[in-house]
């Protein structure tokens, strides 16, 4: 009955503070409406980073002010988180909810440790 969600263990953000990873879920049924939420866990505190609900076959739409973008393909969601800084290094959990049709299922990944390294400032050039 439990829905399995897989995501990479570790991802390194690029120099522009962007990190991408795939969240894949094993759907027990044929869901038509799916909600994907990215959560950040730090010191046992969990906070929402972003969330999007989408109809299967359609694109993910995050809110305009979201730091996340994404695309979906079957039971895979390709997530990108932007604007990350060193202080944002942490465990990012992918949560998937099959909202419709019944029954409802929820799946939680083990989390992706995202490492963010702030770029060194460029030295002044004469």
């Amino acid at each position: 009955k439990a829905m399995h969600v897989a995501q990479p263990a570790v991802v390194l953000a690029n120099s522009r503070g962007t990190a991408s990873f795939v969240c894949e879920y094993a759907s027990p049924g044929k869901a038509t409406e799916v909600r994907v939420t990215v959560l950040r866990q730090a010191d046992s505190q969990v906070t929402e980073v972003c969330a999007a609900t989408y109809m299967m076959g359609n694109e993910l739409t995050f809110l305009d002010d979201s730091i996340c973008t994404g695309t979906s393909s079957g039971n895979q969601v390709n997530l990108t988180i932007q604007g990350l800084r060193a202080m944002d290094t942490g465990l990012y959990i992918c949560k998937v909810e099959l909202m419709y049709p019944p029954p409802y299922y929820m799946g939680i990944g083990n989390g992706t440790q995202i490492y963010v390294i702030d770029p060194e400032p460029c030295p002044d050039s004469d």
Partner: antibody
Framework: QVQLVESGGGVVQPGRSLRLSCAAS????????MHWVRQAPGKGLEWVTF????????YYADSVKGRFTISRDNSKNTLYLQMNSLRAEDTAIYYC???????????WGQGTLVTVLE | EIVLTQSPGTLSLSPGERATLSCRAS???????LAWYQQKPGQAPRLLIY???SRATGIPDRFSGSGSGTDFTLTISRLEPEDFAVYYC?????????FGQGTKVEIK
């Protein structure tokens, strides 16, 4: 701090209706799914119904399907339970509960008592 | 529907003793989706453990959860007077959400 406060309970005759409310505060209501759970006198916990973030998706226990309707007003931070065709076996304390980020019911209201009797 | 069966129905123990409560599921429940709640008379349930073994905020470390698949356990290492209550397990991975019938931990 997170607070859930139920209201609307009372004594009602079989076949009649009642509407429960749950006022939420201390968190972004629209970012959480919500539930109603009930507990008959001296008995255990029974899940009743669930509603999604935007209110578009609702699930019900078989025992209340077709009689109870869950709804929410995100602009008022309030969850509702419309109970029609009430039966004696619906007598219980009704709790609203918030779904935590990782799935468990992390906050509960204090409950409101519904008594259905002749 | 996943049926959860708790045992024993009642546990009679003295303060300072260890309490072991069992919850068995009719089919496999992912460990990420099993919770334990405590309920005292006249009060709402309170979340103790989620994800089978993670303690909720503010829960003392004498409470611990374990298990996977169909068999889960809540352990209270040393019972304090305030721990005498009814304990419920719950699965929340799929609808309908279900609870066990409860285990009452009473003072011997």
């Amino acid at each position: 701090q997170v607070q859930l406060v139920e209201s609307g309970g009372g004594v009602v005759q079989p076949g009649r209706s009642l509407r429960l409310s749950c006022a939420a505060s201390g968190f972004t209501f629209s970012s959480y799914t919500m539930h109603w759970v009930r507990q008959a006198p001296g008995k255990g916990l029974e899940w009743v119904t669930f509603i999604s973030y935007d209110g578009n998706n609702k699930y019900y226990a078989d025992s209340v399907k077709g009689r109870f309707t869950i709804s929410r007003d995100n602009s008022k931070n309030t969850l509702y339970l419309q109970m029609n065709s009430l039966r004696a076996e619906d007598t219980a304390i009704y709790y609203c509960a918030r779904t935590g980020w990782l799935g468990p019911f992390d906050y509960w209201g204090q409950g409101t008592l519904v008594t259905v009797l002749e | 529907e996943i049926v959860l069966t708790q045992s024993p129905g009642t546990l009679s123990l003295s303060p300072g003793e260890r309490a072991t409560l069992s919850c068995r599921a009719s089919q496999s429940v992912g460990s990420s989706y099993l919770a334990w709640y405590q309920q005292k008379p006249g009060q709402a349930p309170r979340l103790l453990i989620y994800g089978a073994f993670s303690r909720a905020t503010g829960i003392p470390d004498r409470f611990s959860g374990s298990g996977s698949g169909t068999d889960f356990t809540l352990t209270i290492s040393r019972l304090e007077p305030e721990d005498f209550a009814v304990y419920y397990c719950q699965q929340y991975g799929s609808s309908p959400w279900t609870f066990g019938q409860g285990t009452k931990v009473e003072i011997k």
